[in-house]
Interface confidence: low
């Protein structure tokens, strides 16, 4: 006869490991007992359990409640055992020794491999700002056994680099993703992908990129000069910009306070029925935590009684400064 077993048994941490040992012999042969042992290079052979055809299963106290026979129905020639709730310390070599009658004893060794699936963690880098050079966007760390694979899935252009640290029973892999921040990356997903034989599917952690920026400011509302006439209602100036974090807007008048009745509502400056007193230089001030920008426009309200006057639509210079 001969023993049917496996060279390697692979199990995920926390699962039950079936250690196979089946005696395939002649019909009249019997299995008397199966002795299971852990083979440790330092401590030698340690008894795990004894499976006796008559007396049943005896488990070493160190493995109490952890070693069982597979559920019935069981073949009398099957000496396999279940090791419940496999932990990393169970990893190693095991031996089954089968005593048969009348053929004598047979033995086989197998290796138990306990996969430790990684629990990845993603750590965002420092705040990203447009204008920075190559900057750490995020790092992703996963520790497992064997070493996990850590990669990045993203449409964003960048560079990735990995390093690993080996632990006695596992390996930690950290991958860093560096990029040159630009506003087009804002809101883009950066996904850490961790692959491991102990995972049914890749583990993915997504980080949404936030890149701080502030666009140039401009003012809309002076496109049609004929609208800026004395008596016209509903005239507005709208300040245009965009940024991350979203910017705040403020309006001032360069040559004095805002005229009576002129209302600031966020990015919009609303005028009451126009008078010549509304002529002047208006400044839109846009700011966020990163920067601030100004755009100024000159408004001249046309009096229809004075046809010689034209509306001045000059947009003056734009200014900005970094915080």
């Amino acid at each position: 006869g001969e023993l049917e077993t496996s060279d390697v048994v692979t199990v995920v941490l926390g699962q039950d490991a079936k250690l196979p040992c089946f005696y395939r012999g002649d019909p009249d042969e019997q299995v008397g007992q199966v002795a299971w042992a852990r083979v440790d290079p330092n401590e030698g052979i340690r008894e795990l359990a004894l499976l006796h055809s008559k007396y049943g299963l005896h488990v070493n106290p160190a493995y109490e409640d952890r070693v069982e026979q597979p559920p019935p129905p069981r073949d009398p020639l099957d000496g396999s055992v279940l090791l419940r709730n496999a932990v990393q310390a169970d990893e190693g070599e095991y031996e089954c020794r089968v005593s048969t009658f009348p053929a004598g004893s047979f033995q086989a060794r197998m290796r138990l491999r306990v996969l430790v699936p990684p629990l990845p963690s993603l750590n965002p880098g420092p705040p990203l700002e447009e204008g920075q050079g190559l900057t750490l966007a995020a790092s992703c760390t996963a520790e497992g056994s064997p070493a996990p694979s850590v990669t990045w899935d993203t449409e964003v252009k960048g560079t990735q680099s990995s390093r690993s640290f080996t632990h006695p029973r596992s390996a930690a892999v950290t991958s860093e993703f560096h990029l040159v921040p630009s506003r087009s990356m804002n809101g883009q997903p950066l996904t850490c992908v961790v692959s491991h034989p102990g995972l049914l599917q890749d583990r993915r952690i997504t980080h949404t990129l936030q890149v701080a920026f502030l666009a140039e400011a401009s003012v809309r509302g002076l496109e049609d000069q004929n609208l800026w006439q004395v008596g016209r209602e509903g005239a507005t100036l709208k300040c245009l910009s965009e940024g991350q974090p979203p910017p705040k807007y403020n309006w001032t008048r360069l040559d004095g306070p805002l005229p009576s009745g002129v209302r600031v509502k966020g990015d919009t400056l609303g005028f009451p029925p126009l008078t010549t007193e509304h002529s002047g230089v208006y400044v839109c001030h846009v700011s966020n935590e990163l920067s601030s920008r100004d755009s100024q426009v000159t408004v001249e309200v046309l009096d229809p009684e004075d046809p010689g006057k034209q509306v001045d639509l000059v947009s003056a210079s734009h200014h900005h400064h970094h915080h």
Partner: antibody, heavy 122, light 107 residues
Framework: QVQLQESGPGLVKPSGTLSLTCTVS??????????WAWIRQPPGKGLEWIGS???????YYNPSLKSRVTIYVDTSKNQFSLKLSSVTAADTAVYYC??????????????WGQGTMVTVSS | EIVLTQSPATLSVSPGERATLSCRAS??????LAWYQQKPGQAPRLLIY???SRATGIPDRFSGSGSGTDFTLTISRLEPEDFAVYYC?????????FGGGTKLEIK
Amino acid sequence: QVQLQESGPGLVKPSGTLSLTCTVSGGSISSGGYYWAWIRQPPGKGLEWIGSIYYTGSTYYNPSLKSRVTIYVDTSKNQFSLKLSSVTAADTAVYYCARDPFPEPPDAFDIWGQGTMVTVSS
Amino acid sequence: EIVLTQSPATLSVSPGERATLSCRASQSVSSNLAWYQQKPGQAPRLLIYGASSRATGIPDRFSGSGSGTDFTLTISRLEPEDFAVYYCHQYGSSPLTFGGGTKLEIK
């Protein structure tokens, strides 16, 4: 500014245990983002990494010393310590503690203690 | 473990001249390589990390290059305070290792 300071006996008897402590000032060990390492340098020779520890207690040792070395951390005192057992004259060296900013750059030992000389002799 | 071999063991150069130090790894360490300067009685000081990035406060006369297994530290114009022992160090895989050092001395 983070500073590291080694302390411990400068003389240890053969077969005894070398014990050193590194006190971190100017920053908290438990803030994360750093490993804390021990490195040694025998007189007139090069540098050898002994091992590193994270504030959570996870340790990584040089296999050549692993059977004799223990590194542990005391976050309440902002210290981490080294124990090296069964020492011989070959363990005579300047012992440095150092900070390893990992995983973020510079991810190499960027801050070092000034070192403490330990002689193994009877 | 990864073995780092530095050459030459001793390099004699005159102040103001250029010095080129080499470090070779027994297997690829990607760009996980640092350079340190050590003066007598002092702790090592980080000069370069990531093979080519200068550490904080390091003068721009120090530059690093290389990737994989071959790395170079270049000091463009030697100042009197640059004469010391230089070590390379790989931190790509455990155990972390150092090179044997290159002693840079005044010619």
